[in-house]
């Protein structure tokens, strides 16, 4: 079997519900998954009117889809929740949705963090 | 609409060899992994193959190790087959599939029977 | 080896309820193994059902439903109709690029 894995260890962390749910908002996640497995980043959103919303971000199990996947890129046209799913630490801090009925790729980057 | 057309089955002699083809249309192929799936006449579904979006990882089920390969051109929207030193269990109808996220086949092709006989 | 089993045959009548299962002998089921179902009529391609355990595809009837039963993946036909008669298999992502199908459950609706 060839095997073209980045190996993922860490992916950027976020829950747009963390209250709720008792969580940290946001920060770094360490992958923990069983032996032989793979690992992937993932990050979901939502685009109300070109606003971007983020959902989560994190550690996503081992998912046949994801392999080999260097950047995150959802491609479904218009769902409630994008999608996407990469591999390597930290893959998950750009997303990108390129739908496949060829509409404009369009790329979210991270806020620039602030100077301290 | 998203279509998988598979080709490249017949008879086939024991020993011999073949590449099936499944063209692949309605989607964004290069975004898709994909895989194989056969059927013996009168049995259940087996898994055989499968192949990343890349085709950087590639991996088989243990009975066609080494005698079949899994191959993908994303240019031509392609996925392919080879199937080296068949046997007799390995005629079967021979199904493409798309794989999405949560490791399932999302969409099948029609299939392509395999016969290998003498 | 990894086997996945599934019972081979299954009748109901219509309008009743069936719940197919799907265990293997490496342990329990869980969602990690992100179980999917398939019907397939002879003849045909298999048809997606079901997938991560209990999402239906697109255009599947509710009547459909997936769920986790005790250590095996179960699924469950509410309101059978004719048109269910069918095969049904469950397949397992054993991760790794590894999957196991079932060996398939033959369902009769009766009558």
């Known amino acids: 079997s060839g095997r073209g894995e980045a190996e993922t260890r860490e992916c950027i962390y976020y829950n747009a519900n963390w209250e709720l749910e008792r969580t940290n908002q946001s920060g770094l996640e360490r992958c923990e998954g069983e032996q032989d497995k793979r690992l992937h980043c993932y990050a979901s959103w939502r685009n109300s009117s070109g606003t971007i919303e983020l959902v989560k971000k994190g550690c996503w199990l081992d998912d046949f889809n994801c392999y080999d996947r260097q950047e995150c890129v959802a491609t479904e046209e218009n769902p409630q929740v994008y999608f996407c799913c990469c591999e390597g630490n930290f893959c998950n801090e750009r997303f990108t949705h390129l739908p496949e009925a060829g509409g404009p790729e369009v790329t979210y980057e991270p806020p620039p963090t602030a100077p301290t | 609409e998203v279509q998988l057309l598979e080709s490249g089955g017949g008879l086939v002699q024991p020993g011999g060899s073949l590449r099936l083809s499944c063209a692949a249309s309605g989607f964004t192929f290069r975004n898709s992994a994909m895989s194989w799936v056969r059927q013996a006449p009168g049995k259940g579904l087996e898994w055989v193959s499968g192949i990343s979006v890349t085709g950087g990882s590639t991996f088989y089920t243990d009975s066609v190790k080494g005698r079949f390969t899994v191959s993908r051109d994303n240019s031509r929207n392609t996925l392919y087959l080879q199937m080296n030193s068949l046997r007799a269990e390995d005629t079967a109808v021979y199904y493409c599939a798309k794989v999405y996220y949560y490791s399932f086949f999302d969409y099948w092709g029609q299939g392509t029977l395999v016969t290998v006989s003498s | 080896q990894t086997v996945v089993t599934q019972e081979p045959s299954f009748s109901v009548s219509p309008g009743g309820t069936v719940t197919l299962t799907c265990g293997f002998n490496s342990g329990s089921v869980s969602t990690s193994y992100w179980p999917s179902w398939y019907q397939q009529t002879p003849g045909q391609a298999p048809r997606t059902l079901i997938y991560?355990?209990?999402t239906r595809s697109s255009g599947v009837p509710d009547r459909f439903s997936g769920s986790i039963l005790g250590n095996k993946a179960a699924l469950t036909i509410t309101g059978a109709q004719a048109d269910d008669e069918s095969d049904y298999y469950c397949v397992l992502w054993m991760g790794s690029g590894i999957w196991v199908f079932g060996g398939g459950t033959k369902l009769t609706v009766l009558g």
């Open positions: 991560n355990t209990n």
